[in-house]
């Protein structure tokens, strides 16, 4: 805190401008008026004052709203926002758009901190839901941002919210998210044609079940290796040979370099050998011929 | 008043890392309205900015390309200080080295308004 | 790596006589806000660089007011009115809107 100390004569701040980057920290403190500083907070950003000076800067902004700033002082915040904690920002109430990009804008370049998770956690419960302006901005500034929420707070995301998801949004998604996600899409793209439905479709296909792959199967898809790495062991296990013969089509020939990882290694397991002789790859480690192919519940139920 | 008073040997092997600390006195290490920085001076380079360290919600570190590699700059809250390691040294690492305060200014650029009093370190066998 | 080019390298100047250096920059330092981030500073033999001179123009505290900053862009100017024995040492410029930061390689400033 910096004591109170009255103002030197003639330093009384006028309007927030240049000649403050010369005002000491106790300067500021007992020369700007904390209701011309609200009013005139769009200046604060144009002028080069020190993080130290923004620290007196803020102390006077909270003391004139102690519940919490308005929105328009909180949209003309600017670098002062990298000077707020959580608990000041779970005051505030952040309806606008434009305000929550302005925000995430001073943080860029910066992980996504404990502030700037506690503004859009606010911003997206005061919206109700998580529209796709918004996770076109969120996912924007921080590609990983889908990733970040639980499967439980996914499930609030809007099928037509899925059109703003980019690729590279879903890149360090686990499988229960994938799972929530997967069904959204598949009902958002529903009205695509093959190729283009394919093309959507890919990054979610880490939460398709077996049924939907086989379907895929039967269109000439292409998928690649590392679309196929990433699908579900246990929806990729009932996949017959021909089946993911038909669903890789020319990228087939890269199971050989993936025979000893999953999903490939346990689904090669699952296949008779004959069947995979078929492929002309040397893969091993199938069912020999003559051997039982128990039901994969079976199994559990016996391990 | 912040006063940055360094310490470390004055000699180090080829190879070998140069280790060195700043103890800050009239701030915080944690602060986040600044950076903690090395710099360093010889006759060949000039001053040398090497990297830095900062707290903002997490610490970060900034390096400078040419030590990249080598170069670790580590904030201790306990001892209120900062620490300079740079790994595998030559002779052409020999300079005086500074520990100096970057106070960051809006948007977010360094100004080096306090600085130590320096040490010569010789990369030497 | 913006680099700074100060000149004259080396200049010697009577006592009472003013004197000036010049530093460029590879790449504007003039930021959207209107402010040049370039500082100037000034070290003394035997110690530590001390700031002079930020934002291009602004004096740092405890700075006399015989040193003056000027200039924009890429091309600034740091001037003494009227050089003083205690103003001996090597004047640095440096940029720091552009990571990372960078010094000119200095002007030597001696007594005639």
């Known amino acids: 805190e910096v004591e109170k100390t009255a103002c030197p004569s003639g330093k009384k701040a006028r309007e927030i401008d240049e000649s403050l980057i010369f005002y000491k920290k106790w300067e500021l403190e007992a020369c700007v008026d904390a209701a011309l500083l609200a009013t005139q907070m769009d200046r604060v950003n144009a002028i080069p004052f020190t993080y130290e000076q923004l620290d007196v800067l803020k102390h006077k902004l909270d003391e004139l709203y102690p519940q919490g700033y308005p929105e328009s002082v909180i949209q003309h915040l600017g670098y002062l926002f990298l000077k707020m904690s959580p608990e000041d920002i779970r005051k505030w109430n952040v309806t606008s758009l434009e305000t929550l990009k302005a925000l995430l804008e001073v943080n860029k370049g910066h992980e996504m901190s404990p502030q700037v998770a506690t503004l859009i956690d606010r911003f997206v419960k005061g919206r109700g839901q998580l529209d796709k302006d918004t996770l076109d901005t969120l996912t924007a500034f921080y590609p990983g941002y889908l990733c970040s929420l639980s499967p439980e707070e996914l499930s609030s995301v809007p099928p037509s919210s899925i059109w703003a998801v980019r690729p590279q949004d879903l890149d360090t998604c686990d499988p229960r998210q994938l799972d929530v996600l997967y069904p959204k899409a598949r009902l958002a793209f529903q009205n695509m044609n093959g190729s283009e439905y394919f093309v959507k479709i890919q990054s979610f296909l880490g939460g398709a079940p077996t049924e939907d792959l086989k379907a895929l199967s039967q269109q000439n898809v292409s998928m690649d290796l590392a679309t196929f790495m990433k699908l579900r062991t246990d929806a990729v296990l009932p996949l017959t040979v021909a089946e993911v013969q038909k669903l890789l089509g020319p990228h087939v020939e890269g199971l050989k370099a993936e025979e000893r990882h999953r999903p490939v290694r346990d689904w090669i397991l699952r296949q008779r050998q004959d069947d995979l002789d078929t492929l002309g790859l040397g893969l091993q480690g199938g069912i020999p011929n003559g051997y039982l192919v128990l039901d994969l519940s079976m199994q559990e139920a016996l391990s | 008043q912040v006063q940055l008073q360094q310490s470390g040997p004055g000699l180090v092997k080829p190879s070998q890392t140069l280790s060195l600390t700043c103890a800050i006195s009239?701030?915080?290490?944690?602060?986040?309205?600044?950076?903690w920085n090395w710099i360093r001076q010889s006759p060949s380079r000039g001053l040398e900015w090497l990297g830095r360290?900062?707290?903002?919600?997490?610490?970060?570190?900034d390096y400078a390309v040419s030590v990249k590699s080598r170069i670790t700059i580590n904030p201790d809250t306990s001892k209120n200080q900062f620490s300079l390691q740079l790994n595998s040294v030559t002779p052409e690492d020999t300079a005086v080295y500074y520990c100096?305060?970057?106070?960051?200014?809006?948007?977010?650029?360094?100004?080096?308004?306090?600085w130590g009093q320096g040490t010569l370190v010789t990369v030497s066998s | 790596d913006i680099v700074m080019t100060q000149s004259p390298l080396s200049l010697s100047v009577t006592p009472g006589e003013p004197a000036s250096i010049s530093c460029r920059s590879s790449l504007s330092l003039l930021h959207s806000n209107g402010y040049n981030y370039l500082d100037w500073f000034l070290q003394k033999p035997g110690q530590s660089p001390q700031l002079l001179i930020y934002?291009?123009?602004n004096r740092a505290s405890g700075v006399p007011d015989r040193f003056s900053g000027s200039g924009s862009d890429t091309d600034f100017t740091l001037k003494i009115s009227r050089v003083e024995a205690e103003d001996v040492g090597v004047y640095y410029c440096?940029?720091?809107?552009?990571?990372?930061?960078?010094f000119g390689q200095g002007t030597k400033l001696e007594i005639k």
């Open positions: 009239g701030d915080s290490v944690s602060s986040n309205s600044v950076a």
């Open positions: 934002l291009g123009s």
């Open positions: 100096a305060r970057g106070i960051f200014v809006v948007p977010a650029v360094p100004r080096f308004d306090y």
């Open positions: 360290t900062y707290y903002r919600s997490k610490w970060y570190n």
């Open positions: 440096m940029q720091g809107l552009h990571t990372p930061p960078s």
